[in-house]
């Protein structure tokens, strides 16, 4: 037999708090236990679930925990079941809501000395007590001219005055706990003698020049007075008119009229109602200028063919909002099809070569109209008027090649040489109109051009073969000024190349033949033995049949190279004393010397007292300090060649005699002493 | 101006030859090779050679190799053509030109005035 | 050798008209490519060279085209001083060599 030894017990319980229904069985074979609430089998949930045989709650709800819970156990084998006692939650709660106005049935219908009643709808279990507060306050019952239901949580105000406007609100507590009003009821009675609005101005634009009605009205029992004052609190009468109101108007009815408002207008105007009791009432009311900015400017559009594009106005900055829509030829556009506009858009679907020309945006307000053009290309796919050709160009002259195409928009040429792209320099140069220029021809230039012609739509391209057209020149052009060394063997070479193979022949300019000493080799000039006699001007003349006949004249000195008589050498000076650097060199012609120093030419015309150089070439610095250590260059040339030798100059400081050292003791070193 | 001078009409005997001359004046003789065309009666022109005044260096058609010797004196601007071993077929009108050029090629211009050798026995 | 053909070898115009005469190289000959006139009793007459210069002193009816092969000698308004004889001449290689002529004569 089934017995329980723990049956579930009705108990109070909270809202939203834990509970637990607890149920044990024993039993000879295996149960399962389960539980029904009011004969309904119970399903876990995250709230609700079994715990062992019990029945966990998470949190106790009022609504779908009120019932009778009963435990079942059931033997699954002889089908004996057995069911424990019933089981109840007294379930405590409180719930808050808002104050709402019982009697009269609408707002409206409150009038002084009528009956108002309000109703605290804060509900609990077990029933709470209600407490009524008016801004804030606590109201006791049996206060004159107000009752407390606590049965019927109301509230009346009997009969209701202006004194007992304001915001009420309830508390109510239990057992359970305490809540107060969720929403509060405003009551408001009025004094038939304070001023109460019967119309409030209202903000006003108007375009400048134009006239702008304010309305304003009260009502009160007697009549209310009105008052009507601008920004800086002066008073506008039809009598006494500030000196920038002067076109204002107040009518009997209250309303204000400004005619021909200017910019000094503008502002807040306050109209004042006063009644013979109670607060004054002030409203306010704002005239604005209508303003309207300019549009900013649009860039050119390029659009390709049977695309889809947009074109955003920006609506000028204005009072009030200006409205905006596009035109295009005068018509304005639809707000549907293929050209349309949609909201500040400009909308082109499926573009066509017909939709390019120019489309305008208006806006407009009170205060005037704007408008602003945006020119829309359609971009076409460029076409041929004049391909590169397959060219033969002059080498040194300028070459052309062309590359005219026509498109929509004005078509964007670029060039490639042997596939890289080339970009403008001194020897290269694009046309407006598409044609490369090659400033001179080189050689090389013979290659493969291509152009290719862009727009937005597409491009095409076309490439040529150049041919250089070699002219006859020297390669490289002889030196026109040349040295031979007297006594030495000598060349002085002369090649050229044109489409034919050239011939080269020396000659004296003067037309004197070459000595038997001098060979003319296959454009080689050669000198077994150079003598005086063979300086003098020569003439490289290099010709063939189909380009004629090229010169190149050559000055040819006989000299003798340079050599050092004198070198300097490393030099050790006291400071303060003279060093002496030497150098002379013989050539002819005869050379000039110079001396570097610290890595500078040392000019003779700037180099102070201290420093002198010789005319044998030899260099002397008087006084010398530590700074003029270093390495000094002798530096030999004349017309011909050029030579140099270096040596460093040291400066130390004068030692002091030991007393161990002889009066005659050399110093460790090459020593000038002056 | 540039002018080129030829000496006048021959009439040579087969096997004989000719020399015909062309002085050069108005430009530097030097500067600009001398090139020979002949013309047979109503037919059109044959290239025959150039020499250089300068270098002396000459170029001969292949079909008068060995039968023609170009040559000039600097001293008094003036281009000689021989021409060796005539037959009949030499007749026609010997003209001299001088070969204006750019560096890049070169045209005939001007042209002497032509000398007339026919052959005949 | 490079051989020039020139056509026709002769042709018949009137004074007034307009004359084309083209010559073809055997080889690319690049822009080198001299015009000669020459008259009954006178030696050849530099017209055009390089192809399409016009020699200092003949009159700009004359106009010269082409490159590579094809070549062309134009005369805009034939002019009675024009009837002769007409030469090519390519100056590209050694040796230089002329066409055959072309002869134009009064209608």
């Known amino acids: 037999a089934i017995v329980f030894i723990k049956q579930p017990s009705s108990q109070d319980a909270l809202q939203g708090r834990r509970a637990l229904l607890r149920c044990e069985v024993e039993a000879p074979g295996p149960v399962h236990v389960y539980w029904l609430l009011d004969g309904a089998p119970v399903q876990d949930t995250e709230r609700r679930f079994a715990q062992g045989s019990s029945l966990s709650f998470a949190a106790v709800d009022r609504l779908q925990d009120s019932g009778t819970f009963q435990c079942v156990a059931r033997d699954d084998v002889t089908g004996e079941e057995a069911r424990s006692a019933n089981a109840s939650f007294n379930i405590k709660w409180i719930e808050a809501g808002p104050v709402v106005l019982k009697h009269p049935a609408s707002e409206a219908e409150i009038q002084p000395q009528t009956q108002v009643t309000l109703r605290c709808h804060i509900d609990g279990h077990p029933r709470p007590t209600y407490q009524w507060f008016r801004d804030g306050t606590p109201l006791s019952d049996g206060q004159s001219n107000h009752t407390v239901s606590s049965k019927e949580r109301n509230l009346t105000l009997r009969p209701a005055g202006p004194e007992h406007s304001g915001l009420y609100s309830c508390c109510a507590h239990s057992a359970f706990g305490q809540a107060c009003s969720s929403q509060n009821f405003t009551l408001s009675i009025a004094d038939e003698s304070f001023a109460r609005v019967v119309l409030a101005p209202q903000d006003v634009v108007v375009a400048r020049y134009e006239e702008a009605m304010f309305h304003c009205q009260f009502s009160a029992q007697p009549p209310p007075s009105l008052q009507w004052l601008f920004e800086d609190e002066t008073p506008i009468t039809n009598r006494s008119r500030p000196p920038h109101l002067r076109r204002a108007t107040v009518f009997a009815n209250g309303s204000l009229l400004l005619t021909q408002v200017r910019p000094r207008n503008a502002g807040i105007y306050r109209c004042i109602g006063q009644g013979q009791r109670g607060p004054p009432i002030i409203l306010e009311a704002t005239l604005h200028l209508a303003e309207i900015e300019d549009m900013p400017l649009f860039e050119p559009r390029v659009f390709t063919a049977g695309s889809e594009e947009r074109v955003t106005c920006l609506p000028p900055k204005g009072l009030p909002e200006p409205s905006v829509w596009w035109e295009h030829a005068g018509v304005r556009l639809p707000t549907h099809g293929r050209v349309y506009q949609k909201g500040h858009e400009l909308v082109l679907a499926n573009i066509a070569e017909s939709d390019a020309g120019v489309y305008t945006c208006h806006a407009a307000n009170l205060a005037g109209q704007r408008r602003q053009d945006v020119n829309i290309t359609v971009a076409t796919v460029p076409s041929w008027l004049k391909k590169p050709q397959d060219s033969q160009l002059e080498e040194g002259k300028p070459g052309y090649l062309d590359c005219l195409t026509q498109a929509t928009p004005k078509p964007t040429v670029v060039w490639y040489r042997n596939q890289m792209l080339i970009s403008e320099d001194s020897r290269f140069e694009v046309f407006k109109n598409g044609t490369l220029r090659i400033n001179s021809v080189e050689v090389y230039d013979g290659t493969w051009y291509r152009c290719m012609s862009s727009t937005p739509a597409g491009s095409i391209e076309a490439q040529a073969r150049v041919q250089v057209l070699e002219k006859l020149k020297f390669t490289p052009p002889p030196q026109p000024q040349q040295c031979m060394e007297f006594d030495k063997e000598a060349t002085v070479p002369c090649s050229a190349t044109g489409r034919e193979k050239p011939t080269i022949k020396w000659e004296r300019a003067d037309g004197s033949s070459l000595p038997e000493w001098v060979t003319d080799n296959a454009g080689t000039l050669h000198f077994a033995r150079v003598t005086r006699d063979d300086a003098g001007n020569y003439t490289c003349i290099a010709s063939n049949g189909p380009q004629g006949q090229i010169r190149a004249h050559v000055q040819l000195t006989v000299a003798v190279f340079i050599t050092f008589k004198v070198e300097p050498e490393r030099t050790t000076v006291y400071q303060g004393h003279t060093a002496l650097l030497q150098c002379e060199a013989q050539g002819d012609p005869k050379p000039l010397i110079q001396w570097k120093g610290k890595d500078r030419i040392l000019d003779p015309t700037k180099l102070g007292p201290r420093m002198h150089i010789f005319q044998n070439g030899s260099l002397v610095i008087h006084d010398v300090a530590p700074e003029d250590s270093g390495r000094y260059t002798c530096i030999a040339g004349n017309s011909c060649n050029i030579k140099h030798t270096e040596a460093p100059l040291y400066v130390v400081d004068k030692p002091v005699p030991e007393e161990s050292e002889g009066p005659g003791s050399p110093p460790p070193y090459k020593m000038i002493q002056t | 101006q540039v002018q080129l001078v030829q000496s006048g009409a021959e009439v040579k005997k087969p096997g004989a030859s000719v020399k015909v001359s062309c002085r050069a004046s108005?430009?530097?003789?030097?500067?600009?090779?001398i090139h020979w065309v002949r013309q047979a009666p109503g037919q059109g022109l044959e290239w025959m050679g150039w020499?250089?005044?300068?270098?002396?260096?000459?170029n001969y058609a292949q079909k008068f190799q060995g039968r023609v010797t170009m040559t000039r004196d600097t001293s008094i601007t003036t281009a000689y053509m021989e021409l060796s071993s005539l037959t009949s077929d030499d007749t026609a009108v010997y003209y001299c030109?001088?070969?204006?050029?750019?560096?890049?090629?070169?045209?005939?211009?001007?042209w002497g005035q032509g000398t007339l050798v026919t052959v005949s026995s | 050798d490079i051989q020039m053909t020139q056509s026709p070898s002769s042709l018949s115009a009137s004074v007034g008209d307009r004359v084309t005469i083209t010559c073809r190289a055997s080889q690319s000959i690049a822009i080198y490519l001299n015009w000669y006139q020459q008259r009954p009793g006178k030696p050849p007459k530099l017209l055009i060279f390089?192809?399409?210069s016009l020699q200092s002193g003949v009159p700009s009816r004359f106009t010269g085209s082409g490159s590579g092969t094809d070549f062309t000698l134009s005369i805009s308004s034939l002019q009675p001083e024009d009837f002769a004889t007409y030469y090519c001449?390519?100056?590209?290689?050694?040796?230089?060599?002329f066409g055959q002529g072309t002869k134009v004569e009064i209608k």
């Open positions: 001449q390519q100056s590209y290689s050694t040796p230089p060599t």
């Open positions: 020499i250089s005044p300068n270098s002396g260096g000459t």
């Open positions: 108005g430009y530097t003789f030097t500067d600009y090779f």
């Open positions: 390089t192809a399409s």
């Open positions: 030109a001088r070969y204006d050029y750019d560096g890049y090629s070169g045209w005939f211009d001007p």
